[in-house]
Amino acid sequence: PEPPTACREKQYLINSQCCSLCQPGQKLVSDCTEFTETECLPCGESEFLDTWNRETHCHQHKYCDPNLGLRVQQKGTSETDTICTCEEGWHCTSEACESCVLHRSCSPGFGVKQIATGVSDTICEPCPVGFFSNVSSAFEKCHPWTSCETKDLVVQQAGTNKTDVVCGPQDRLRA
């Protein structure tokens, strides 16, 4: 019979024949032959392979180094790598999360639009007219100016993006 030019899913072509790939969590020891099946071996502890494969070496689990602010989000297995994230108050510097940096704070005049997570930094936005922020914070949103009218008071000092309005009593008409 003609040797195959393509193989089924979870197979690979070698020496003009189709061999079974090794399942996730196992590595290739020897290719199949006309008489024998593919030989696979489980990955060692702290190693993994996450696909059907013909790899002769397993990959090492990622180390979530606490000295870099990292912690484990998902423990590695024979079929999956360890997933790292950052300690509270920190976020990853890259998608691979190999190190962490402190969450940015939003300066006075800016509020938090989106609170940081283990993988994304704080997103700040300028406080629009009618809102203010007088602190540097990684959590505080812009606060609305106080409404003097609802307290039967009048604006004595206008608000800014960094300060609230100052309310005062209404001037009484003298008799």
């Epitope: 484990v72 024979s78 079929e79 999956t80």
Partner: antibody
Framework: EVQLVESGGGLVKPGGSRKLSCAAS????????MHWVRQAPEKGLEWVAY????????YYADTVKGRFTISRDNAKNTLFLQMTSLRSEDTALYYC????????????WGQGTSVTVSS | DIVMTQSPSSLTVTAGEKVTMSCKSS????????????LTWHQQKPGQPPKLLIY???TRESGVPDRFTGSGSGTDFTLTISNLQAEDLAVYYC?????????FGAGTKLELK
């Protein structure tokens, strides 16, 4: 037959140090991750530390971080736990446990060694 | 840290009965890569070290009788012992094997009526 035998426990004064050992036999020690887990008198189980088969990966519980050091000697089939700055709350039975590369669970436990921290 | 909550804390039982205990985790124990729930059950008899009973939520360790059944997913898990035997009197601990720090429930103690 898999065997894990802990030793090195005893009475220690607060602030003192102690080094625990766990002698492994009946399996290829260098192929397995290892854990220390403790159990305070009449209490539940508390994970303490982990070391991977090849010494590359080490994790600690926050309660012992900076005070305890896990290590292993694959040539001597022995796991260690160096404990410093001991506190009364470290009083417990300390177990070593094996983690394989398939289940990723603690599949064998030693009998434990008792550490008492008291003045 | 993942908090593991077991209930009840103790159960008074008789031989031959069916026993069910619960374990809840404060976050999902589902590994997104291989779709396995990393929930482990250990059995600890008086004066003995813990013994692995069930891993991946429902897979019995070799040598564990089939009267022990683990079930559940995500955050809610159950251990069932059907036709309870005297030798099953022990404390049963569920454990988060999903992430570090590894955390244990406070245990469910089975006592004879």
């Amino acid at each position: 037959e898999v065997q894990l035998v802990e030793s090195g426990g005893g009475l220690v004064k607060p602030g003192g140090s102690r080094k625990l050992s766990c002698a492994a036999s009946g399996f290829t020690f260098s192929d397995y991750g290892m854990h220390w887990v403790r159990q305070a008198p009449e209490k539940g189980l508390e994970w303490v530390a982990y070391i991977s088969s090849g010494n590359r990966i080490i994790y600690y519980a926050d309660t012992v971080k900076g005070r305890f050091t896990i290590s292993r000697d694959n040539a001597k089939n022995t796991l260690f736990l160096q404990m410093t700055s001991l506190r009364s709350e470290d009083t417990a039975l300390y177990y070593c446990a094996r983690q394989d590369g398939y289940r990723y669970a603690m599949d064998y436990w030693g009998q434990g060694t008792s550490v008492t921290v008291s003045s | 840290d993942i908090v593991m909550t077991q209930s009840p804390s103790s159960l008074t039982v008789t031989a031959g009965e069916k026993v069910t205990m619960s374990c809840k985790s404060s976050q999902s124990l589902l590994n997104s890569g291989n779709q396995k729930n990393y929930l482990t059950w250990h059995q600890q008899k008086p004066g003995q070290p813990p013994k692995l009973l069930i891993y991946w939520t429902s897979t019995r360790e070799s040598g564990v009788p089939d009267r022990f059944t683990g079930s559940g997913s995500g955050t809610d898990f159950t251990l069932t012992i059907s036709n309870l035997q005297a030798e099953d009197l022990a404390v049963y601990y569920c454990q988060n094997d999903y992430t570090y720090p590894l955390t244990f429930g406070a245990g469910t103690k089975l006592e004879l009526k």
